[in-house]
Each structure stands twice: as C-alpha cells, then as structure tokens.
C-alpha cells in the first residue's frame, strides 16, 4: 500500500509557500499543482461566510 502524501504531516506543518502563476495549492496533499488538476472552484453564494485566508493560490469553493 502506498503511504498517503500527508501521513507524516501534522497540524503544525509550515504555511504553504505561495504557488507560482498557473499553479494552485492543493490543500489535500499540501503542495502546489497545476490549477487545471483541481476542481473548478464554485462561486461563493452571496451572504456566505468569508473564505479562509488565502495563504497561497488556494482554490475557493
């Protein structure tokens, strides 16, 4: 069985380094990938709670 990419990463992992243009931070494996590999972010509905701090080019749902 392959180990998960986050098996050794705890909650105190350092904040992500900002991704280069055309890359987005994959929050589930904790590294930058081509934005096209992630789901297309859906626009937040009006009145929804504010998004989390964008410490990287993090896709917002």
């Amino acid at each position: 069985m392959r180990r998960g990419p986050r098996s050794l990463r705890g909650r105190d992992a350092p904040a992500p380094t900002p991704c280069v243009p055309a890359e987005c931070f994959d929050l589930l494996v904790r590294h930058c990938v081509a934005c096209g590999l992630l789901r297309t972010p859906r626009p937040k509905p009006a009145g929804a709670s504010s998004p989390a701090p964008r410490t990287a080019l993090q896709p917002q749902e």
């Epitope: 909650r11 994959d26 929050l27 589930l28 590999l37 989390a52």
Partner: antibody
Framework: EVQLVESGGGLVQPGGSLRLSCAAS????????WNWVRQAPGKGLEWVGY???????YYNPSLKSRFTISRDTSKNTFYLQMNSLRAEDTAVYYC???????????WGQGTLVTVSS | DIQMTQSPSSLSASVGDRVTITCRAS??????????MHWYQQKPGKAPKLLIY???DLESGVPSRFSGSGSGTDFTLTISSLQPEDFATYYC?????????FGQGTKVEIK
Amino acid sequence: EVQLVESGGGLVQPGGSLRLSCAASGDSITRGYWNWVRQAPGKGLEWVGYINYSGTTYYNPSLKSRFTISRDTSKNTFYLQMNSLRAEDTAVYYCARPHNYGAMDYWGQGTLVTVSS
Amino acid sequence: DIQMTQSPSSLSASVGDRVTITCRASESVDDYGISFMHWYQQKPGKAPKLLIYRASDLESGVPSRFSGSGSGTDFTLTISSLQPEDFATYYCQQTSKDPWTFGQGTKVEIK
C-alpha cells in the same frame, strides 16, 4: 452536473474477488479526487480510499492492502478491486467526488456487495 | 488515525425543535486556517448528502436552518427548527489527515 454511476456489485463467496466500477460524467477523472466509501448494513460510513488527478492512491489502512483503486482515463471510469473478501466486507459501496477541501458533494447511487457462502 | 466521536448517538425530537449534534476529533483538524470538517445527512436507502463543509460553510441548496460551527477538535451541527424531512442520520467527517474518517453517526428520530 457531475453524475457517478457504480456497477459490479453482487454476491461473492468468502475469499473471492470483485471489481466495482464508477463511471463519471460531467467532469474528467484527471481532475480532483475520486473516492470510494462503504456502508455495512445498519452501520455507519467508512472511507475506503481515493485516487487523485495524478493517479496517486491512498487507502484506509484497516483494509490491509486487499483493496486497490485504479482508473481508465479513456473511459472516465475508476475502479475498486477487492480481493480476499470477507463477510465483514458486505456493504453498499459508494463512489464520491469531493470539493477541494475533501467534502464529498457528488455521490453515486451505491452498489451492494454481499460476501456469503 | 483521527478518531471522530459524535454525540448523542441518537435523539428524539419534535418538529420545530432546535437540535444540536456535536463531533469531537481526537486531534485538531485545522490547518492553514481551515477546519477540514464536514457534515452529511443520510436517509435510509439513499446516498449521503453534504450539508456543511469546512466546519461552517453551507452547501449550495441546503436550507439555512442548518448551520455548523467550531474549530480545532470540537464541532457542532445545529438545526434551528426541525422539519419533517430532517429526520435522518447525520455524520461528521474529517479530511485533515489520511485516512479520512467519519463519526459513527447520530440518528434523529421523531418524538
């Protein structure tokens, strides 16, 4: 709109094998994460594992390498190969696709796997 | 693995009641300022339905009587005024660390 359709469930004897399929439409399985979740009769949800955009897989360690997730990008379908099946693997198996945060907002209808002699 | 413990396991309530379900994680599910905690509703014979993601964000199309709160290890799902269609089983889930794990479920029954 994303649609997920599972198939391949059925009755299998203990020690046998089965391959479940999840055909996705509305998005490419080369983007995002694609999951299997199961639910034994009358029990709660149990995460089985995922395959992501790069083909990387991760499994619930409790399954002890008996299950393998793979994909066929030409068919936009991903699979759950289950070997050395046991009675306790009897469950409804769902495929699901999550947000970028892991929350699963698209689910298939489920396919029942019964392991019995 | 992160263990998810829901309470209560079941509850009886009436239409119009305010219902609160709690979920406690064995360690923090927060990272990068985000709580990787989600809530689902499931009715018999049906696939789960996502209600709340990222601890407090309401999924599109879900009624506003559902809300989520919490951070770190302690989270709450609240139904402000229980409706007949809300009688179901509710699950929390964390996706902060592999393997992703669910709570054992809370069944909301009619009193």
